[in-house]
């Protein structure tokens, strides 16, 4: 079987994913589910997990989901919020993966793949 | 001042091949995303394919009519694109368009093909 | 194969409004963008994601959308917007490009 997928590697397939449910997309993502906005810091992946896995139903960010997953080290699970340490604020679904997009993309620019 | 520039079109008989090349400069060319276009002598425009940048999976789309003949690169070091045709027919006869697609993409923002060369000619017959 | 389809010809005289239409399956959910081109010049982008113009293009320019069309207008056409009008936009999976057909805009001078 395969070895482990490189982390530089591993953020760039999902920064890849990213954009192919982004591009060119003006159609509401998920329908225009809100999420909570997550601080894009430490902790960042499992964060954004827990805002991402509240939305059910929406086949366009299940592959996203999965690839956020090998990034936690821990389980997640809908409703839960270890990672989200502020919750005061609602973004679409759309915005959020937009943001994430762009900050992915500066730290592979930085070479920070974990 | 943002700047494509193509070169390397000519004649070439069926079957042949030839490589097109698009010099940029005036932006940074490793985040663009770049397309193909062509355009055939009284005819609309038609694309060709695309390829992303490196960060955004350096992934490549070709247009039904010249996938698997068509092989579309790019040297960022060197600030260019490619487009190398194989087993060319009569109908590739066109003006060959290079654009830039997605300046903004690292930014998040999508402009559509808003930077175009001036075409290169390539002219398929026997 | 994922289709665009535009009128071939448009025809307005000076001071009208002349308005191209662009039909596609996926524009629902993709932008469409359009492309100006004149004689033995290469395209010029007059729009973006339906409804954005790009700087340097006039006001007299603008985009809309709704359901499967759509569509550019131009306000006052004048004698030098005289050009081949190209749509342009994805497929459903944002992968491959797609040009309409094009139409040719003559302004009755």
């Known amino acids: 079987s395969p070895g482990p997928v490189p982390p530089s590697t591993a953020l760039r397939e999902l920064i890849e994913e990213l954009v192919n449910i982004t591009q060119n997309q003006k159609a509401p993502l998920c329908n225009g589910s809100m999420v909570w906005s997550i601080n894009l810091t430490a902790g960042m992946y499992c964060a954004a997990l827990e805002s991402l896995i509240n939305v059910s139903g929406c086949s366009a960010i299940e592959k996203t989901q999965r690839m956020l997953s090998g990034f936690c080290p821990h389980k997640v699970s809908a409703g839960q919020f270890s990672s989200l340490h502020v919750r005061d604020t609602k973004i679409e679904v759309a915005q959020f993966v937009k943001d994430l997009l762009l900050h992915l993309k500066k730290l592979f620019r930085e070479g920070r793949f974990n | 001042e943002v700047q494509l520039v193509e070169s390397g079109g000519g004649l070439v008989k069926p079957g042949g091949s030839l490589r097109l090349s698009c010099a940029a400069s005036?932006?940074?060319?490793?985040?663009?995303?770049m397309s193909w276009v062509r355009q055939a002598p009284g005819k609309g425009l038609e694309w060709v394919g695309r390829?992303?940048?490196?960060?955004?999976?350096?992934?490549?789309n070709y247009a039904a009519p010249v996938k698997g003949r068509f092989t579309i690169s790019r040297d960022d070091s060197k600030n260019t694109l490619y487009l190398q045709m194989n087993s060319l027919k009569t109908e590739d006869t066109a003006v060959y368009y290079c654009?830039?697609?997605?300046?903004?993409?690292?930014?998040?923002?999508?402009?559509?093909?808003?930077?175009w060369g001036q075409g290169t000619t390539v002219t398929v017959s026997s | 194969s994922y289709e665009l389809t535009q009128p071939p010809s448009v025809s307005v005289s000076p001071g009208q409004t002349a308005r191209i239409t662009c039909s596609g399956d996926?524009?629902?959910?993709?932008?469409a963008y359009w492309y100006q081109q004149k004689s033995g010049q290469a395209p010029v982008l007059v729009i973006y994601?339906?409804?954005k113009r790009p700087s340097g293009i006039p006001e007299r320019f603008s985009g809309s959308s709704s359901g499967t069309m759509a569509t550019l207008t131009i306000s006052g056409a004048q004698v030098e917007d005289e050009a081949d009008y190209y749509c342009?936009?994805?497929?459903?999976?944002?992968?491959?490009?797609?040009f309409g057909g094009g139409t040719k805009l003559t302004v009755l001078g």
């Open positions: 342009y936009s994805t497929d459903s999976s944002g992968n491959h490009g797609v």
């Open positions: 996926a524009l629902p959910e993709k932008y």
């Open positions: 994601e339906d409804t």
């Open positions: 654009a830039t697609d997605q300046v903004g993409a690292y930014y998040g923002d999508y402009y559509g093909m808003d930077v």
């Open positions: 005036g932006f940074t060319f490793s985040n663009a995303w």
């Open positions: 390829i992303r940048s490196k960060i955004d999976g350096g992934t490549i």
